[in-house]
């Protein structure tokens, strides 16, 4: 994993300016686990930044990610109705620069070195789960979310007419 | 147009059963988390009861005050959302909101105009 | 239980002027770097109404005169220029654990 202590130091001046012509209602820096405490980590590996679920050695430090909240100003196509109501979407980024993307072709998730305005891959639709847990859907893709597979983030297609196990999409935001 | 309409309220005695429906309409009910809120007569407001997704297992919570006597289910097929209440004492009587939490779960954004509970002798 | 009490019970403000109502939690409503802090608007014979979500922003259609503030444990919902459409009572409510709990209501009146 590597180091992020320079994310506290970017994140005010980073977003002093907006992102998407509107400013982000609030920002948190949290680590990123997954339902079952495995931690989500980054690694420059050829010059590109590889995300990772591992297990954490003892006292080895969580990498942190800056989660920069938005209100959504249309409701999701998944949401079947115009009157859904304002939708929290979520941007995630572990070091200056990079965000977290959808590939939806390869159903993967990539980080991206990206401009403002972001690309609407950089954006998620934040779900409330109990457990304290959240998922995070694609903006560009209702219905699908990040998920965990083979030690990897990966997009999921999630079904509400399948009985998915849906602990591999549930994530914990931990300040410490 | 989106809709939450109640129905199966009326006068019970106490330590009797009533199973309430709500029957939604205007939007994919399968997609929403669904909630049972309710308001004695003059009182305030006091939520119930809460049904998941199929994903999440339909997993239901419940306010301690009707745990062990309420039951809250879904028919999706039926775009229908249920709260079967037994062993109804006099303090149940209550104006009952069959309510949808907004897509992400962050709040109740449509609620049912409500169905009357009345529980005496 | 986290219980949520408001204060006044009851408020009489003048039309266009400000109405200003707190709503206290015993603990800490905070998850995820925000407040799980709603505010409803109910009427008389109306089933309640989204007006603000996590503590402050505002709901869809919810005109610009509502506004809510706060964290963590004290929260306000403001009402800039009262309007006589705005008789009703105003309840919080934290969504934060379960069981989800409401405060006892403020109501508001014309003086």
């Known amino acids: 994993a590597f180091g992020i202590s320079g994310v506290q130091k970017y994140t005010r001046a980073l977003h002093d300016s907006s992102i998407t012509g509107i400013s982000p209602i609030t920002e948190y820096l949290a680590s990123l686990s997954t339902y079952n405490d495995q931690s989500i980590t980054f690694a420059l590996e050829d010059e590109s930044y590889e995300i990772y679920v591992e297990d954490l050695k003892k006292d080895e430090k969580k990498d942190k990610v800056l989660l920069s909240y938005y209100e959504s100003q249309h409701p999701s196509n998944e949401s079947g109705d115009g009157v859904d109501g304002k939708m929290l979407m979520v941007t995630l980024s572990p070091t200056k620069d990079f965000w977290l993307h959808a590939n939806n072709k390869e159903h993967s998730v990539e980080l991206h070195k990206c401009e403002k305005p972001l690309p609407d891959q950089a954006f998620f639709v934040l779900h409330n789960m109990h457990s304290n847990c959240v998922s995070f859907e694609c903006k560009t893709d209702p219905g699908v979310f990040i998920g965990v597979k083979d030690n990897h983030l990966a997009l999921i297609k999630v079904d509400s007419s399948e009985n998915l196990c849906t602990e591999n999409i549930l994530f914990k935001l931990s300040e410490t | 147009e989106v809709q939450l309409v109640e129905s199966g309220g009326g006068l019970v005695q106490p330590g009797g059963s009533l199973r309430l429906s709500c029957a939604a309409s205007g939007f994919t009910f399968s997609n929403y988390w669904m909630n049972w809120v309710r308001q004695a007569p003059g009182k305030g407001l006091e939520w119930m009861a809460e049904i998941t997704l199929k994903f999440n297992n339909y997993s239901t919570h419940y306010a301690e005050s009707v745990k062990g006597r309420f039951t809250i289910s879904r028919d999706n097929s039926k775009n229908t959302v249920y709260l079967q209440m037994n062993s109804l004492r006099a303090e149940d009587t209550a104006v009952y909101y069959c309510a949808r939490r907004n897509y992400g779960n962050w709040y109740i954004n449509v609620w049912g105009q409500g169905t009357l509970v009345t529980v005496s002798s | 239980d986290i219980v949520m009490t408001q204060s006044p019970d009851s408020l009489a403000v003048s039309l266009g002027e400000r109405a200003t109502i707190n709503c206290r939690a015993s603990e800490s409503v905070d998850k995820f770097g925000m407040s799980f802090l709603n505010w409803y608007q109910q009427k008389p014979g109306q089933p309640p109404k989204l007006l603000i979500f996590?503590?402050?922003s505002q709901g869809s259609g919810v005109p610009d005169r509502f506004s809510g503030s706060g964290s963590g444990t004290d929260f306000t919902l403001t009402i800039s220029s009262l309007q006589a459409e705005d008789v009703a009572v105003y309840y919080c409510q934290q969504s934060k654990d379960i069981p989800y709990t409401f405060g006892q209501g403020t109501k508001v009146e014309i003086k």
């Open positions: 996590v503590a402050s």
